[in-house]
Amino acid sequence: NECPELQPPVHGKIEPSQAKYFFKDQVLVSCDTGYKVLKDNVEMDTFQIECLKDGTWSNKIPTCKIVDCRAPGELEHGLITFSTRNNLTTYKSEIKYSCQEPYYKMLNNNTGIYTCSAQGVWMNKVLGRSLPTCLPECGQPSRSLPSLVKRIIGGRNAEPGLFPWQALIVVEDTSRVPNDKWFGSGALLSASWILTAAHVLRSQRRDTTVIPVSKEHVTVYLGLHDVRDKSGAVNSSAARVVLHPDFNIQNYNHDIALVQLQEPVPLGPHVMPVCLPRLEPEGPAPHMLGLVAGWGISNPNVTVDEIISSGTRTLSDVLQYVKLPVVPHAECKTSYESRSGNYSVTENMFCAGYYEGGKDTCLGDSGGAFVIFDDLSQRWVVQGLVSWGGPEECGSKQVYGVYTKVSNYVDWVWEQMGLPQSVVEPQVER
């Protein structure tokens, strides 16, 4: 009762390997690394056959099929390139994930190279089977911002893409009769979050308590350049409105807030985040030059339709920007203390502007970002948010604009965004 000689499958082997096989002898068929046993269209690791009483084998020898990792998973904001010809996805094939540059960058500078493993899974040396993460690049406009050597008196038209983080925030409270509406600016921090000043998102219906506006009343416009043409802009409603819990309406201390967008916005040449600064209580150094952009929407009678569609009755149709120096804290405190009133320039604020006053201290909407170029990381960093002072008493001598010192709130911002700082390290100025 001897069974016929067995031929191992191509890329496989049989064990035990004997010259002769008799009744009740069993053979295990397995495949080389990177191959799987295929029997009746079913893949398995091994297959056992037995020599029967009548001298036949219980089954035919199966074949060995090369492992296929199949189409790799899609990467959000990323691309896949195949290293092998014909886009092979079989064992030892290589693929490379990359992020949609220059708008996204791979977390931890990962190589993005994945190899099809013997187990049929795309594997990376560092991340294993996990996909890489594409994080938005921050503080790197598609157009180079001008050098900050010369002082600009007054505003200057911004080219499209110069301030890709600039957001126009429109608040329209339809629960009021008549409808209340106002505008502010903000700065994009990620595909889903806008940083702004708390006073922009506070309902003035209450004075003794701080009440945020309802999220249903907030619309954010990104990639907007000329308010008369919103065709190229992305508009988004708000999923959440978060005011700093300690925001004080009497002195605008802790004047910082966040808006979470309903849907992440696609990044591109006109929509890119700004970087957050390091956590540092000193804030920006005195005399450093920063930029503030804004449409200067100041007319109280302008309607939302007019501002977004026609852009009439506004200070400027086109986004404007100014360069302003940071003012030493003591000098700013003194300038406000010398005026009648209980103005307090706290440690959560800094001032910018010129002693002689002028138009440059008036431009920029509330909540807009005061950005400084960080030489080390070669990125633009949001150091301040337009808070109070300048825009109220436009051009007054020695009335500096007061800005929220963002560096005091970095932890709070990350906490609200629900991202541990380590995950978003590339977003932080280094």
Epitope: P178, D180, Q204, T208, N299, P300, W388
Partner: antibody, heavy 116, light 112 residues
Framework: QIQLVQSGSELKKPGASVKVSCKAS????????MSWVRQAPGKGLKWMGW????????TYADDFKGRFVFSLDTSVRTPYLQISSLKAEDTATYFC?????????WGQGTLVTVSS | DVLMTQTPLSLSVTPGQPASISCKSS???????????LNWLLQRPGQSPKRLIY???KLDSGVPDRFSGSGSGTDFTLKISRVEAEDVGVYYC?????????FGQGTKVEIK
């Protein structure tokens, strides 16, 4: 040092218009709304409405819709109350008060007398 | 509109004695935000009004602690523990919960 300084008394003829100003100082102007309150001679206080100093949007109580207009000049931190087609019953002291609802600081009042 | 009813309409008090003014609203002043926007002010003779108390019981800065406010829902009270000569004038309660804000008719306090 928070102060609301109103314009001086006015004597007007029926049918004329008057504009009362309320110069604010000592606080962040756009942080608080501004209310307007009327007090007829020897009578109590009546809230006329308020203006949002950030948006510039006014809200009027029903009795003060039509001939009464609240406006604003943020650059000089001044809200205004304008009354048109004045009637004898508009004779009153008009107060501005800081806040849409708080009314924690009050101007000294402006007496508007309407008489032929 | 919410009707605010003050009692009494006038009050004559001996210096050093306590005084109490009641203010009732025609509907609850508890707002949807959980706060009660009931305030008290004093208008001294020939002067503009001055707020004394906000959110039912919070004293404005500079207001002597002989003044206190209490109440909830529709019933509120202003108390002066020991009346002084400078306390004379008309006291008004007003609500800032329901639009339009409304004042009580005022309580005139004078010294005996």
């Amino acid at each position: 040092q928070i102060q609301l300084v109103q314009s001086g008394s006015e004597l007007k003829k029926p049918g004329a218009s008057v504009k009362v100003s309320c110069k604010a100082s000592g606080y962040i102007f756009t942080s608080y709304g501004m209310s307007w309150v009327r007090q007829a001679p020897g009578k109590g206080l009546k809230w006329m409405g308020w203006i949002n100093t950030y948006s510039g949007v006014p809200t009027y109580a029903d009795d003060f819709k039509g001939r009464f207009v609240f406006s604003l000049d943020t650059s000089v931190r001044t809200p205004y109350l304008q009354i048109s087609s004045l009637k004898a019953e508009d004779t009153a002291t008009y107060f501005c008060a800081r806040g849409g609802e708080a009314m924690d600081y009050w101007g000294q009042g402006t007496l508007v007398t309407v008489s032929s | 509109d919410v009707l605010m009813t003050q009692t009494p309409l006038s009050l004559s008090v001996t210096p050093g004695q306590p005084a109490s003014i009641s203010c009732k609203s025609s509907q609850s002043l508890l707002d949807s935000d959980g706060k009660t926007y009931l305030n008290w002010l004093l208008q001294r003779p020939g002067q503009s009004p001055k707020r004394l108390i906000y959110l039912v019981s919070k004293l404005d800065s500079g207001v002597p602690d002989r003044f206190s406010g209490s109440g909830s829902g529709t019933d509120f009270t202003l108390k002066i523990s020991r009346v002084e000569a400078e306390d004379v004038g008309v006291y008004y309660c007003w609500q800032g919960t329901h639009f339009p804000w409304t004042f009580g008719q005022g309580t005139k306090v004078e010294i005996k």
